[in-house]
């Protein structure tokens, strides 16, 4: 499988937003690339979001996706929004070179995203 690199650890912002770069080493001249973010908890793997893009064009996730992203060459900048403390976990970047053949697939080692829910503001009397 292709080599896919991603940071080991990312801390989500207080607004529940986490961003990281997923970079892949392409063996060939792909024109169509699919990027999928997977969350792994123990032996369970769930798909967080996915997007297919044409090289040179923007990465487009579905309207209701919690992910957004941009692409530049063999790099994809991914942002996951709406994260809560319970979403802390290992997020894996999966890259597939869909077209033209041959098909290549690469899996990153995963980014551990830590999410801390903000403390509620104490009531204050004025």
């Amino acid at each position: 499988a292709m080599h896919v690199a991603q940071p080991a650890v990312v801390l989500a912002s207080s607004r529940g937003i986490a961003s990281f770069v997923c970079e892949y080493a392409s063996p060939g001249k792909a024109t169509e690339v699919r990027v999928t973010v997977l969350r792994q908890a123990d032996s369970q793997v769930t798909e967080v979001c996915a997007a297919t893009y044409m090289m040179g064009n923007e990465l487009t996730f579905l309207d209701d996706s919690i992910c957004t992203g941009t692409s530049s060459g063999n790099q994809v900048n991914l942002t996951i929004q709406g994260l809560r403390a319970m979403d802390t976990g290992l997020y894996i970047c999966k890259v597939e070179l869909m077209y033209p053949p041959p098909y290549y697939l690469g899996i990153g080692n995963g980014t551990q995203i830590y999410v801390i829910d903000p403390e509620p503001c104490p009531d204050s009397d004025f």
């Epitope: 499988a1 080493a25 063996p27 060939g28 999966k94 053949p101 041959p102 690469g106 899996i107």
Partner: antibody, heavy 115, light 108 residues
Framework: EVQLVESGGGLVQPGRSLRLSCTAS????????MNWVRQAPGKGLEWVGQ??????????YYSDSVKGRFTISRDDSKSIVYLQMNSLKTEDTAVYYC??????WGQGTTVTVSS | DIQMTQSPSSLSASVGDRVTITCGAS??????LNWYQQKPGKVPKLLIY???NLADGVPSRFSGSGSGTDFTLTISSLQPEDVATYYC??????????FGGGTKVEIK
């Protein structure tokens, strides 16, 4: 039209060597990781090994059953991949297929190891 | 090394039947799985790549599903020309890119 043509198979005695060749055409050879897959008579498919391409420094990988005996190499200028088989055993008897990625397959060449 | 276990090893079904073949990996392989069809006396042919993607020229009655460790190849309506042996293969690094043991499909 994509074509992969294997050659070099035949009858060989145990302990001897054989070199298989696979000539590719109809696709961008240099973009492909090339594999060898074999199939013993009446048996299933067995992945033998792989050679990656220039962006991956022509890394090679082998199944445990052939490691240390078989060597894969490639010549991108000629679009050929080779399988050098040394210290052959009777259990190496099989049809050997060359594949481009895993998308394109050759017709196979038969290797028989027997005394 | 990751082991690939296919079941059943053989099956017999009627024309028009829905046929399901399963492939299990001993570890998570994230959808890094191909399916191949090998008709008697012929060269194997790529059917499904990346667990779910139909290869060019493959009839739509074939489909692949699954993720993690459990994968399925489904033929929605078995045809006489589907008589073959079907193999799954793990395509996740590091190699070996192990094949399953195969499933022989016959017509009743």
């Amino acid at each position: 039209e994509v074509q992969l043509v294997e050659s070099g198979g035949g009858l060989v005695q145990p302990g001897r060597s054989l070199r298989l060749s696979c000539t590719a055409s109809g696709f961008t050879f240099s973009d492909n990781w090339m594999n060898w897959v074999r199939q013993a008579p009446g048996k299933g498919l067995e992945w033998v090994g792989q050679i990656r391409n220039k962006p991956y420094n022509y890394e090679t990988y082998y199944s445990d059953s052939v490691k240390g005996r078989f060597t894969i190499s490639r010549d991108d200028s000629k679009s050929i991949v080779y399988l050098q088989m040394n210290s052959l055993k009777t259990e190496d008897t099989a049809v050997y297929y060359c594949t481009g990625g895993m998308d394109y397959w050759g017709q196979g060449t038969t290797v028989t190891v027997s005394s | 090394d990751i082991q690939m276990t296919q079941s059943p090893s053989s099956l017999s079904a009627s024309v028009g039947d829905r046929v399901t073949i399963t492939c299990g990996a001993s570890e998570i392989i994230y959808g890094a799985l191909n399916w191949y069809q090998q008709k008697p006396g012929k060269v194997p042919k790529l059917l499904i790549y990346g667990a779910t993607n139909l290869a060019d020229g493959v009839p739509s009655r074939f489909s692949g599903s699954g993720s993690g460790t459990d994968f399925t190849l489904t033929i929605s309506s078995l045809q006489p020309e589907d008589v073959a042996t079907y193999y799954c293969q793990k395509i996740l690094s590091p190699p070996p890119w192990t094949f399953g043991g195969g499933t022989k499909v016959e017509i009743k």
